[in-house]
Amino acid sequence: TLNSVLNSNAIKNLPPPLGGAAGHPGSAVSAAPGILYPGGNKYQTIDNYQPYPCAEDEECGTDEYCASPTRGGDAGVQICLACRKRRKRCMRHAMCCPGNYCKNGICVSSDQNHFRGEIEETITESFGNDHSTLDGYSRRTTLSSKMYHTKGQEGSVCLRSSDCASGLCCARHFWSKICKPVLKEGQVCTKHRRKGSHGLEIFQRCYCGEGLSCRIQKDHHQASNSSRLHTCQRH
């Protein structure tokens, strides 16, 4: 069962974390090699992966979505699962990998010409149904921006980065823009290959913080062009 996976010694007996206390994200420590991890239609083995319990898609990384790992859908714990690649089956946008979205139950490329109209249409359709909302956070942000006591804090609706507090930038979050944290060293960043391509992003990331630039991670140099991972690194 899922809980036995979550509670196995392989999951629990990790090396002590490298960071993460005092309100800062820590550095990822990988463990539990060979866990079965659903990606696309088949179960595949992903080395060095620790199942991450979640309640919503937004808690997962950019390459993941939140769901039950069992086909029937365990009503209990959900975990972050690998995003679905193009032409794989989907039920909502968050299931599809970056650069794709869910159309008629299939992940399709976010083609610039058709993307915007279709995604807004889908958002309108699913807005009233709590189970199919695309993103709980931005939906809540759009509806209840009055809940924010301090203007420009993380999660606040914004128009430009100057609307956000120090250490935050204004970035797209589905159909709205909210204040998000400026990226720290080691965090995944987006390197735009061509001008204007950031227009396709549903979850736009902030830029790298001071003294950092967005560069290909050393161990990803051999990877194919499309899967190269960029991280914020010291100049």
Epitope: P17, L18, G19, G20, G23, H24, P25, G26, S27, A28, V29, S30, Y49, Q50, Y52, C54, A55, E56, E58, E59, C60, G61, T62, D63, E64, C80, G136, Y137, R140, T141, M147, Y148, Q153, E154, G155, S156, K180, P181, L183, Q187, V188, F203, R205, C206, L229
Partner: nanobody, 124 residues
Framework: EVQLVESGGGLVQPGGSLRLSCAAS????????MKWVRQAPGKGLEWVSH????????MYADSVKGRFTISRDNAMNMLYLQMNSLKPEDTAVYFC?????????????????RGQGTQVTVSS
């Protein structure tokens, strides 16, 4: 800046109870699911419990199910963990945590925002 401050830990006998609290600030608390994780001496982080934004749904690790209850007060920006029927194996530092979310490609407990933790010791 995201700030999470845990309190309520202490020394308790097996079978006893404790209520942990977590005061959150620096972010819009009510739009984030929250969780409790723990770290036993010499071990890695272990997920304990989760609660949705509105508190409508909760999830628990098998090891604490039926004994622990997670809750939240969005008006006060507070997260709670009621711990009953405590066992020696519950001894750990307990952290209140929030996902780092879409700033990483893959989520992990180590990447979460979390506080300094509160020590819970269950011993006779």
């Amino acid at each position: 800046e995201v700030q999470l401050v845990e309190s309520g830990g202490g020394l308790v006998q097996p079978g006893g109870s404790l209520r942990l609290s977590c005061a959150a600030s620096g972010f819009p608390f009510s739009i984030y699911p929250m969780k409790w994780v723990r770290q036993a001496p010499g071990k890695g982080l272990e997920w304990v419990s989760h609660i949705t934004r509105d508190g409508g749904r909760t999830m628990y690790a098998d090891s604490v199910k039926g004994r622990f209850t997670i809750s939240r007060d969005n008006a006060m920006n507070m997260l709670y963990l009621q711990m009953n029927s405590l066992k020696p194996e519950d001894t750990a530092v307990y952290f209140c945590a929030r996902s780092a979310g879409k700033v990483v490609s893959r989520a992990s407990l180590e990447n979460d925002y979390r506080g300094q933790g509160t020590q819970v010791t269950v011993s006779s």
